[in-house]
């Protein structure tokens, strides 16, 4: 539980905080878990402990491993673990997923991108910011304290943003970079209610008795990532799972994202071996999200077999 993943690039500074917190007056001992060897506190060492912080100045790939910190007070000891991975610098521009910090979302009204972990370091402004490896230029971008502000955010501003700064330790400078993804929530013309594209309201679908039939419930929920959005089928106002007819099952179809940015979901209702009694049921396609629900109702009717003799 008290374990924390930390990562960095070789030849850059990396500072890791002990996952167990204590008062500043408590002593903290650091060990390299594999060898149980104590980490020195003398600052002349490349890797040294400084209270709650473990400093790699600079880091090397060989430093990767699990480090144990023990917070000691007069009445108790608390143990934490720092799982440190140091990666080789990439020659190309791509930042692999394992080097990414948490994704942040912005919109036209709020577009701050904070530089991850920067509060652990002794740095001075300004920060340098890069998007997809390109230095950011233009009046729309403002490096402010530990974050980047983007004015008039557009969908095209989504991407991977890297902050670069210098950590100073006893007069020596070390470079640090950190990257996170930025997604744009489009608030312009955003339709907040679900929109059912199929089936049509009060649609009558023709089916053949004894054959299989499929009904598709398809709805769109807005642009970008949708939280708590769902499409599902109901029979006579009851959930499929509660209705208890094994011939009738629903299965998730495609998660779609159209060129206009709309996020859509499909749910397919499969009726095996259609029976007469299925024609008496009301089939409801439901689309729900945080803002409300939509319901389109379908009924089945018997398709008359083609009379080949006439």
């Amino acid at each position: 539980k008290f374990s924390k993943q930390s990562w960095g690039l070789e030849n850059e500074a990396l500072i890791v905080r002990c996952p167990r917190q204590g008062k500043p007056s408590y002593t903290v001992d650091w060990y390299y878990s594999q060898t149980n060897k104590s980490i020195p506190t003398q600052e002349r060492n490349r890797v040294f402990a400084s209270g709650q912080l473990l400093k790699f100045l600079p880091a090397a790939v060989a430093d990767s491993g699990i480090y144990t910190c023990i917070v000691r007070s007069p009445t108790f000891n608390r143990t934490g673990y720092a799982n440190v991975t140091i990666y080789k610098k990439q020659s190309d521009c791509n930042v692999p997923d394992y080097l990414m910090y948490s994704t942040v979302s912005g919109s036209e009204k709020n577009s701050k991108i904070y530089c991850p972990t920067i509060d652990l370091y002794n740095w001075t402004a300004p920060l340098e910011w890069f998007k997809n490896c390109q230095a950011l230029q233009g009046s729309r971008y403002r490096a402010h304290k530990s974050f980047l502000v983007i004015d008039n955010v557009m969908t095209e501003d989504a991407g991977d943003y890297t902050c670069k700064f210098i950590h100073n330790e006893n007069g020596a400078n070390y470079s640090v970079t950190a990257t996170r993804s930025f997604t744009v929530k489009d608030e312009q013309g955003f339709s907040l209610f679900p929109v059912i594209g199929a089936p049509a309201q009060n649609e009558i679908k023709e089916v053949e008795i004894g054959k299989n039939a499929n009904l598709t419930c398809s709805a769109c929920f807005g642009k970008g990532t949708q939280f708590l959005a769902a499409v599902l089928w109901q029979l006579n106002g009851t959930k499929i799972t509660d209705f208890g007819e094994p011939r009738i099952q629903q299965e998730e179809g495609q998660n779609q994202s159209f060129s206009n940015g709309l996020a859509c979901l499909d749910m397919v209702l499969r009726i095996a071996d259609v029976k007469e009694e299925d024609l008496l049921l009301q089939y409801d396609c439901l689309a729900l999200n945080l803002h409300g629900l939509r319901r389109h109702t379908v009924r089945l009717s018997r398709k008359n077999p083609i009379d080949h003799h006439s």
Epitope: C220, G292, R295
Partner: antibody, heavy 117, light 112 residues
Framework: QVQLVQSGAEVKKPGSSVKVSCKAS????????VAWVRQAPGQGLEWMGG????????NYAQKFQGRVTITADESTSTAYMELSSLRSEDTAVYYC??????????WGQGTLVTVSS | DIVMTQSPLSLPVTPGEPASISCRSS???????????LDWYLQKPGQSPQLLIY???SLQSGVPDRFSGSGSGTDFTLKISRVEAEDVGVYYC?????????FGQGTKVEIK
């Protein structure tokens, strides 16, 4: 048949809270939404918020954000609307309604809440 | 929020005669799936509101067919082909296309 039965009239002091209940019957409660609408004396209808089933989330009109809490208990098929920091202008009839899917097809009988010192 | 404007605000009617109420929205209520999310409700004196028309023109089950709805986009109309005494009350339009849902201010229909 579908029915929504609301709790009785309430008289409240300014600054206090009121919790109105709405018991549903005659339909599968968990597969329909519940909306809350209020009507001040002699005034029109005002949509306050709603509860979305299955994903179990409530949504509120901006005007009431922070003051209203809408919940639902599926085991008793009952929806609740709690309004806090009451003021005299909250005196109104509060209705719950079944959200069929964008339209409110059945309504409760209404609960009169009077806020007076 | 979307503003719904009804007219007239008061409508004196004669039983057996037709009546018409207009509702205008500040933004289009027509969605990409072809539906206009606009409903009409009637609140009879001393009663809770009841749904008459949904999706601009679909008659709610159990509602007499003398009621009809029409319109698309921003302009909508509720028509009563032959008013009956029991039709008196306040009629409200409500949009459910944009968050949050909003009602018109109401049209009071009374017998002349």
């Amino acid at each position: 048949q579908v029915q929504l039965v609301q709790s009785g009239a309430e008289v409240k002091k300014p600054g206090s809270s009121v919790k109105v209940s709405c018991k549903a019957s005659g339909f599968s409660f968990s597969t329909y939404g519940v909306a809350w609408v209020r009507q001040a004396p002699g005034q029109g209808l005002e949509w306050m918020g709603g509860f979305v089933p299955i994903i179990g989330s409530a949504n509120y009109a901006q005007k009431f954000q922070g003051r209203v809490t809408i919940t639902a208990d599926e085991s008793t098929s009952t929806a609740y609307m709690e309004l806090s920091s009451l003021r005299s202008e909250d005196t109104a009839v509060y209705y719950c309604a079944r959200d069929y899917g964008g339209n409110l097809d059945y309504w409760g009988q209404g609960t009169l809440v009077t806020v007076s010192s | 929020d979307i503003v719904m404007t009804q007219s007239p605000l008061s409508l004196p009617v004669t039983p057996g005669e037709p009546a018409s109420i207009s509702c205008r929205s500040s933004q289009s209520l027509l969605h990409s799936n072809g539906y206009n999310y606009l409903d009409w409700y009637l609140q009879k004196p001393g009663q809770s509101p009841q749904l008459l028309i949904y999706a601009a023109s679909s008659l709610q089950s159990g509602v007499p067919d003398r009621f009809s709805g029409s319109g698309s986009g921003t302009d909508f109309t509720l028509k009563i082909s032959r008013v009956e005494a029991e039709d008196v009350g306040v009629y409200y339009c409500m949009q459910g296309a944009h968050w949050p849902p909003t009602f018109g201010q109401g049209t009071k229909v009374e017998i002349k």
